[in-house]
């Protein structure tokens, strides 16, 4: 029962985490204009992985996609890649874990197969979560670096009375969504790995065998722990854990004139 609960909870937590990673990847607010010196602004800039936007004081919002691929910073490309890898691994993990759920019966699938699938999905969730956390952290580091660089030269002289005020960017909501989502996916993956141990068969994988001892006959079947018998390889009363040697096959705008907000 505890195993089923751990597996089910791991699945749900991972599902929420992956949904969060997808949401974070799609969100426009990865970085938002720093309003420290000017809390009320006529033009509010914010940027995502795929487009950058402006919310005007008039209430209109306009976004512009990054239509170039080669012209984008390598770090941004890396963050995109990490987030997409995280989503893909997470999605595959979810697919595998659905079939691995103890509460779902699919044909005559053995517990050992479910255990292996649970472990596989758990590892995928862990890697997916790590990818998301890494992606968000790389972007955050990039922001911090740029923030202090733009603070150092906040005003770039243009001669005479003309000056260019650089827009400084700070952490956007998507970063926090990404960190939390990555963490949840990671936790879900760990829970799946833990559940895998409880799902593994407790003795060897052979069928029931009759042993004829002198004087009496006892049949041992794979199942609960047996005290006092010295038969089989499980002599020390430990659960047999097949460390996942048999893995399953892995199935691998521009907006109209105005968007009113």
């Amino acid at each position: 029962m505890a195993v089923t609960a751990c597996q089910g909870l791991g699945f749900v937590v991972s599902l929420i985490g992956i949904a969060g990673i997808i949401a974070a990847t799609c969100m426009d607010q990865w970085s938002t204009q720093d309003l420290y010196n000017n809390p009320v602004t006529a033009v509010f800039n914010y940027q995502g992985l795929w487009r950058s936007c402006v919310r005007e004081s008039s209430g209109f919002t306009e976004c512009r996609g990054y239509f170039t691929l080669l012209g984008l910073p390598a770090m941004l490309q890396a963050v995109r890649a990490l987030m997409i890898v995280g989503i893909v691994l997470g999605a595959i993990g979810l697919l595998v874990s659905i079939f691995a759920l103890k509460c779902i019966r699919i044909g005559s699938m053995e517990d050992s197969a479910k255990a292996n699938m649970t472990l596989t999905s758990g590892i995928m969730f862990i890697v997916s979560g790590l990818c998301a956390i890494a992606g968000v952290s790389v972007f955050a580091n990039m922001l911090v670096t740029n923030f202090w660089m733009s603070t150092a030269n906040m005003y770039t002289g243009m001669g005479g009375m003309v000056q260019t005020v650089q827009t400084r960017y700070t952490f956007g909501a998507a970063l926090f969504v990404g960190w939390v989502a990555g963490g949840l996916t990671l936790i879900g993956g760990v829970m799946m790995c833990i559940a895998c141990r409880g799902l593994a068969p407790e003795e060897t994988n052979y069928k029931a065998v009759s042993y004829h001892a002198s004087g009496h006959s006892v049949a041992y079947k794979p199942g609960g722990f047996k005290a006092s018998t010295g038969f089989g390889s499980n002599t020390k009363n430990k659960k047999i854990y097949d460390g996942g040697a048999r893995t399953e096959d892995e199935v691998q705008s521009y907006p109209s004139k105005h968007d009113y907000v």
Partner: antibody, heavy 118, light 113 residues
Framework: QVQLVQSGAEVKKPGASVKVSCKAS????????VNWVRQAPGQGLEWIGM????????RLNQQFKDKATLTRDTSTSTVYMELSSLRSEDTAVYYC???????????WGQGTLVTVSS | DIVMTQSPDSLAVSLGERATINCLSS????????????LTWYQQKPGQPPKLLIY???TRDSGVPDRFTGSGSGVDFTLTISSVQAEDVAVYYC?????????FGQGTKLEIK
């Protein structure tokens, strides 16, 4: 069609207050900010502030923070600007204008002349 | 506050000729998020309220004749009237829509020679 109709001309004594109204029609009143701009005789344009009709949110030019109070009445689709402690230099034509994309003012009222004279 | 400086203060051109009005901002009006310049041009005829001509530095408002063209980016902007008509006699203002308080240029008076 979009229209902003302002109240009539006012003559006030120094130290008095005046409340200028701007009635909007022909568009969804609560969706657009309304600006107030003043123009002294023979002078240029000066932005006073703006109010959002769906809430009490305002943006005021600091120069006018002790001078102008912006309010609205959604039931009548009207915005108001009250000017207090009037002085002779407050004599001007006061315009209301709708805020459009690009923070541009696309529709303007006909203007209200406020004369401050003793 | 952003200071908007227009030049010249007044301009006299013959009918059918080109008129150019410049507007210099004390600070860049370019928004990084959408790469648009928050600069607006208005036309004001005597006894009338101003009329919106161009927003986002180069986008003509609906109903504005195509002889009016806005250009420029960052701090330097230009309003060009390709072929001046008699009805274009007015005062032209540029406006900063980038940051509060919104500020206007002092105006440029266009007259017919």
């Amino acid at each position: 069609q979009v229209q902003l109709v302002q109240s009539g001309a006012e003559v006030k004594k120094p130290g008095a207050s005046v409340k200028v109204s701007c009635k909007a029609s022909g568009y969804s009143f609560t969706n657009y900010w309304v600006n107030w701009v003043r123009q002294a005789p023979g002078q240029g344009l000066e932005w006073i502030g703006m109010v959002h009709p769906s809430g009490s949110e305002t943006r005021l030019n600091q120069q006018f923070k002790d001078k102008a109070t912006l309010t609205r009445d959604t039931s009548t689709s009207t915005v108001y600007m009250e000017l207090s402690s009037l002085r002779s230099e407050d004599t001007a034509v006061y315009y209301c204008a709708r805020v459009w994309s690009g923070n541009a003012f696309d529709y303007w009222g006909q203007g209200t002349l406020v004369t401050v004279s003793s | 506050d952003i200071v908007m400086t227009q030049s010249p203060d007044s301009l006299a051109v013959s009918l059918g000729e080109r008129a150019t009005i410049n507007c210099l901002s004390s600070q860049s009006l370019l928004a990084s998020g959408n790469q648009r310049n928050y600069l607006t041009w208005y036309q004001q005829k005597p006894g009338q309220p101003p009329k919106l001509l161009i927003y986002w530095a180069s986008t003509r408002d609906s109903g504005v004749p195509d002889r009016f063209t806005g250009s420029g980016s960052g701090v330097d902007f230009t309003l060009t009237i390709s072929s001046v008509q008699a009805e274009d006699v007015a005062v032209y203002y540029c406006q900063n829509g980038f940051s509060f308080p919104f500020t206007f240029g002092q105006g440029t008076k266009l007259e017919i020679k």
